[in-house]
């Protein structure tokens, strides 16, 4: 799991209730106007539009990504930017706004009739980070599920994990994604930290399977911080 | 549509700990953008208590619990928690699990803002000597 920058906030001094929200039991609570960030020592007055701090996509909502917000910023400092309508620059689906995708570089248009023919090809260009799609999270790079008949076995180009069979999962491979096996117990993984490491990896390993996570092997305790090794083991 | 149920609640002393689970069922709750706790104490309107990412890496608290509640999920039992500690009177509430699908747009405020969540029916604690 990700340690977020946002990791355990106080949200202090909510404000008075708006009054009820339709369909809920109760009112509404309005949002925090301070937030402790931690190490710090005074709350933070925020607003609707400060920068959303995150470490990968499905942090951000569905009209952003996450990215740094500078060309060739600090990898360490990403935050969730507005999403690229059609015709703009991009680098990976994610980059897209909801009913588009990355295509050679540009967000062009997913209407399925022009979609269809390339998804091949588009999929070979995906240099997104995918934890995304990692458990079945609906993501916009996307692929309608109508066009898959058959989900894809090991080995088998994919943009999301929902386009895996069962046990697999959809990871990096070089530039491309493809089905590879969920982990088990003992297996070595991937423990991401904040720095856009994430981001950087050629061959993406799976998650952990259901009720492992991915921890510091027991007798690497002692190691250094850079050479610890990190195993599925039990909850 | 999701399903939320509440457990866990009771009576409890000063001091003492409860944890409360919530489990949600008909969806999964790593569909699910956020995982909330809120809670309506006697007479007053509901308040946002705690709330956790879908990455388990964000996790929110109201000023009021901050150190003595943990907010945490287990996305392979499809289940919530709220731990308890240090329990005080003034805690004395219907607690509420709630789960709020992905924004648009991501904010803080968007974990503490009540009618981005579906809800569950709530379960009482009540911190009395």
């Known amino acids: 799991t990700l340690n977020s920058v946002l990791n355990s906030n106080a949200i202090k001094n909510l404000p008075p209730p708006l009054g009820g929200a339709a369909g809920h039991p109760g009112s509404a609570v309005s949002a925090a106007p301070g937030i402790l960030y931690p190490g710090g020592n005074k709350y933070q007055t925020i607003d609707n539009y400060q920068p959303y701090p995150c470490a990968e996509d499905e942090e951000c909502g569905t009209d952003e990504y996450c990215a740094s917000p500078t060309r060739g910023g600090d990898a360490g400092v990403q935050i969730c930017l507005a999403c690229r309508k059609r015709r703009k620059r991009c680098m990976r689906h994610a980059m897209c706004c909801p009913g588009n995708y990355c295509k050679n570089g540009i967000c062009v248009s997913s209407d399925q009739n022009h979609f269809r023919g390339e998804i091949e090809e588009t999929i070979t260009e995906s240099f997104g980070n995918d934890h995304s799609t990692l458990d079945g999270y609906s993501r916009r790079t996307t692929l309608s599920s109508k066009m898959y008949h058959t989900k894809g076995q090991e080995g088998s180009v994919c943009l999301r994990s929902s386009d895996c069979a069962s046990g697999l999962c959809c990871a990096r491979h070089f530039w491309s994604k493809i089905c590879k096996p969920v982990l088990k117990e003992g297996q070595v993984c991937t423990k991401h930290r904040r720095k856009g490491s994430h981001g950087l990896e050629i061959f993406q390993r799976c998650y952990c399977g259901e009720g492992l996570s991915c921890r510091i092997q027991k007798d690497h305790h002692q190691a250094s911080n850079s050479s610890r090794l990190h195993t599925c083991q039990r909850h | 549509e999701v399903q939320l149920v509440e457990s866990g609640g009771g009576l409890v002393q000063p001091g003492g700990s409860l944890r409360l689970s919530c489990a949600a069922s008909?969806?999964?709750?790593?569909?699910?953008?956020?995982m909330g706790w809120f809670r309506r104490a006697p007479g007053k309107e509901r308040e946002f208590v705690a709330a956790?990412?879908?990455?388990?890496?964000?996790?929110f608290y109201a000023d009021s619990v901050k150190g003595r509640f943990t907010i945490s999920a287990d996305n392979s039992k499809n289940t919530a928690y709220l731990q308890m500690n240090s329990l005080k009177p003034e805690d004395t509430a219907v607690y509420y699990c709630?789960?709020?699908?992905?924004?648009?747009?991501?904010?803080?405020?968007?974990?503490?803002?009540?009618?981005?969540?579906?809800w569950g029916q709530g379960t009482l604690v009540t911190v009395s000597s």
């Open positions: 709630a789960a709020a699908p992905r924004p648009k747009r991501a904010s803080v405020q968007y974990f503490s803002t009540s009618s981005n969540y579906d």
């Open positions: 008909g969806y999964t709750l790593k569909n699910y953008y956020a």
């Open positions: 956790i990412s879908r990455s388990g890496g964000t996790t």
